[in-house]
């Protein structure tokens, strides 16, 4: 059976949208009006992993691109990157762990925890126009809460 996917956009809790910044980086900034068309549309795939009532494992691909968010060690630090994959083989139900995020739903907000690096989360900075990154702290200066907007296929 093919893996199930939904198209969506994400905004952080400060309402910053995510856009491409160069070929392999996302950044977060406030967008309005026609500029909203710049925001990245994700293909969120529902993949194999540890699931609970609040937690659903997903992979986050960029719609119609062979790029997925992945978590790897760089200089001994868990790091978020956009990784190119073979579109013939992705998405798939059993994604490699570096591509898997635990989508955690708390009070109508979403957190995306790395399955590879527990307690590390997709994060944005308070500042405008900064890279989206993998952060190891919740509840501090950096933002780890998001909302999801569904996009028709």
């Amino acid at each position: 059976a093919p893996v199930r996917s939904l198209n969506c956009t994400l905004r952080d809790s400060q309402q910053k949208s995510l856009v491409m910044s160069g070929p392999y980086e996302l950044k977060a900034l406030h967008l309005q009006g026609q500029d909203m068309e710049q925001q990245v549309v994700f293909s969120m795939s529902f993949v194999q992993g540890e699931e609970s009532n609040d937690k659903i494992p997903v992979a986050l691909g960029l719609k119609e691109k062979n790029l997925y968010l992945s978590c790897v060690l760089k200089d001994d630090k868990p790091t978020l990157q956009l990784e190119s994959v073979d579109p013939k083989n992705y998405p798939k139900k059993k994604m490699e762990k570096r591509f898997v995020f635990n989508k955690i739903e708390i009070n109508n907000k979403l957190e995306f925890e790395s399955a590879q690096f527990p307690n590390w989360y997709i994060s944005t900075s308070q500042a405008e126009n900064m890279p989206v990154f993998l952060g190891g702290t919740k509840g501090g200066q950096d933002i780890t809460d998001f909302t999801m907007q569904f996009v028709s296929s």
Partner: nanobody
């Protein structure tokens, strides 16, 4: 043509047990995650439980965890729901769903569902 035929519903007293079955045809059963959803009188659809293709992973709504057990027999193309310690609030029509995937805490999508079997828990 995909067909899902539920059976096993009925009237049971609080604390009692029932086993629901869902006979599937028209698709390669073993390839699909399957599940159960239910609709109580006057209420919306509620996700109950899911089981992965291969049957090695099972998922339950908090309201049924520890009381219901989902299982599958791929050789018989059949999905089961064993319901123990039934309560009045379990009264509902239970539907078998093909390719059932939960995408938010209480939201899910599926491709096909059956006609349902009624479970009534009452003394």
């Amino acid at each position: 043509e995909v067909q899902l035929l539920e059976s096993g519903g009925g009237l049971v007293q609080p604390g009692g047990s029932l086993r629901l079955s869902c006979a599937a045809s028209g698709f390669t059963f073993e390839d699909y995650q399957m599940g159960w959803v239910r609709q109580a009188p006057g209420k919306g659809l509620e996700w109950v439980s899911s089981i992965s293709a291969m049957g090695n992973r099972t998922y339950y709504a908090d309201s049924v965890k520890g009381r219901f057990t989902i299982s599958r027999d791929d050789s018989k193309n059949t999905l089961y729901l064993q319901m123990n310690s039934l309560r009045a609030e379990d009264t509902a029509v239970y539907y078998c769903a093909q390719n059932l995937v939960r995408y938010m805490k209480s939201q899910w999508m599926f491709d096909y569902w059956g006609q349902g079997t009624l479970v009534t828990v009452s003394s």
